[in-house]
Interface confidence: medium
């Protein structure tokens, strides 16, 4: 018992949010302010993220979690943990390196990110063109020809629910 | 380095025609915008236009639509703005800026300036 | 166009002294604001963008803060080379359009 103690880290009972500090003979030491340590056994707290400039503060650090940034209005996150803010564009544009460019004929983007999108080809499911596409929005297929004919319904029934966890049959 | 060295200071008459330069370096002038900023004597400054040199795509501010025209050439990496028919009203100094535009880090600024060109008309 | 309008257009102070200078946009701008400043006989040089971000190499005692129609710029400290004239420039629309400028003066 006395052997395997001795073999212990003294470390590994510091618990997050503290750091083992070699030079007060690897106490448990809180972890200085704009610091934290997420996990027990650090043997240093690791420096807060600071949400600067275009980034602001979606999550204030604490001694046992970092920092969560989020962007600024106008702004939206990019990457791992919002690693980078990127511009919004209006709906109806997307972003290039030249800046927010409008979606070009026959295609639309319907949210501030991302980029420009194809009007969807109601002809390749049979439909037709019910409401057109804008920059905005995407086209709005309806029933096709031949389900408008005389005596047709135009309204298509609803396929029958499946129960959730089984296979159809 | 980044930087943007304009031409030398002119005096013109009215009636004149004239084309200032700014030359720039320390990055792909292709890849960004650059516009023109007017300073009238103890004024404040006035965006002109601006002119993304990968393909010539110009937009103009209402105010100097018409009365200058932006151009640039790849070749030398040099943005150039030109007035056909110069008035004593154009007396100002004229600065251009790389236009840091649509990036990552923030909106469209103007990052990288030239260091004027003195523009005098007088008869 | 959107206008611009800054305050006060000219003020005296201290070196020492915090300096606070406000910008109001025509119509809500979100954070495209930028910061200048200028000195006699040079060019403009960017201090501040997207409303609070401080350009690389500026100074510290230089913040920005603001969103929609009402920003600020502050000097925490004035030094003697921040004597200058500064604009504040809305980058949100097409033509981008400039306040009139406030001149920092030395008391």
């Known amino acids: 018992f006395e052997r395997t103690r001795s073999l212990q880290d003294p470390c590994s009972n510091c618990p997050a949010g503290t750091f083992c500090d070699n030079n007060r003979n690897q106490i448990c030491s809180p972890c200085p302010p704009n610091s934290f340590s997420s996990a027990g056994g650090q043997r240093t707290c690791d420096i807060c993220r600071q949400c600067k400039g275009v980034f602001r503060t979606r999550k204030e650090c604490s001694s046992t979690s970092n920092a969560e940034c989020d962007c600024t209005p106008g702004f939206h996150c990019l990457g791992a943990g919002c690693s980078m803010c990127e511009q919004d564009c209006k709906q109806g544009q997307e972003l290039t390196k030249k800046g927010c460019k409008d979606c070009c004929f026959g295609t639309f983007n319907d949210q501030k990110r991302g980029i420009c999108r194809p009007w969807t080809n109601c002809s390749l499911d049979g439909k037709s063109v019910l409401v057109n596409g804008t920059k905005e929005r995407d086209v709005v297929c309806g029933p096709s020809p031949a389900d408008l004919s005389p005596g047709a319904s135009s309204v298509t029934p609803p396929a029958p629910a499946r129960e959730p966890g089984h296979s159809p049959q | 380095e980044v930087q943007l060295v304009q031409s030398g200071a002119e005096v013109k008459k009215p009636g004149e025609s004239l084309k200032i330069s700014c030359k720039v370096s320390?990055?792909?002038?292709?890849?960004?915008?650059i516009g023109w900023v007017r300073q009238m004597p103890g004024k404040g400054l006035e965006w002109m236009g601006i002119?993304?040199?990968?393909?010539?795509?110009?937009r103009y501010s209402p105010s100097f639509q018409g009365q200058v025209t932006i151009s640039a050439d790849k070749s030398i990496s040099t943005a150039y703005l030109q007035w056909h028919t110069l008035k004593a009203s154009d007396t100002a100094m004229y600065y251009c800026?790389?236009?840091?535009?649509?990036?990552?880090?923030?909106?469209?600024?103007?990052?990288?300036w030239g260091q004027g060109t003195l523009v005098t008309v007088s008869s | 166009d959107i206008q611009m309008t800054q305050s006060p257009s000219s003020l005296s102070a201290s070196v020492g002294d915090r300096v606070t200078i406000t910008c109001r946009a025509s119509?809500?701008?979100?954070?495209?604001l930028n910061w200048y400043q200028q000195k006699p006989g040079k060019a403009p040089k960017l201090l501040i963008y997207?409303?609070?971000s401080l350009q690389s190499g500026v100074p510290s005692r230089f913040s920005g803060s603001g969103s929609g129609t009402d920003f600020t710029l502050t000097i925490s400290s004035l030094q003697p080379e921040d004597f200058a004239t500064y604009y504040c420039?809305?980058?949100?629309?097409?033509?981008?359009?400039f306040g009139q400028g406030t001149k920092v003066e030395i008391k």
């Open positions: 420039q809305q980058s949100y629309s097409t033509p981008p359009t």
């Open positions: 997207a409303a609070s």
């Open positions: 002119i993304y040199p990968g393909d010539s795509d110009t």
């Open positions: 119509q809500s701008i979100s954070s495209y």
């Open positions: 800026a790389r236009h840091q535009g649509y990036s990552f880090s923030g909106s469209h600024i103007d990052d990288y």
């Open positions: 320390g990055y792909s002038f292709t890849n960004y915008w």
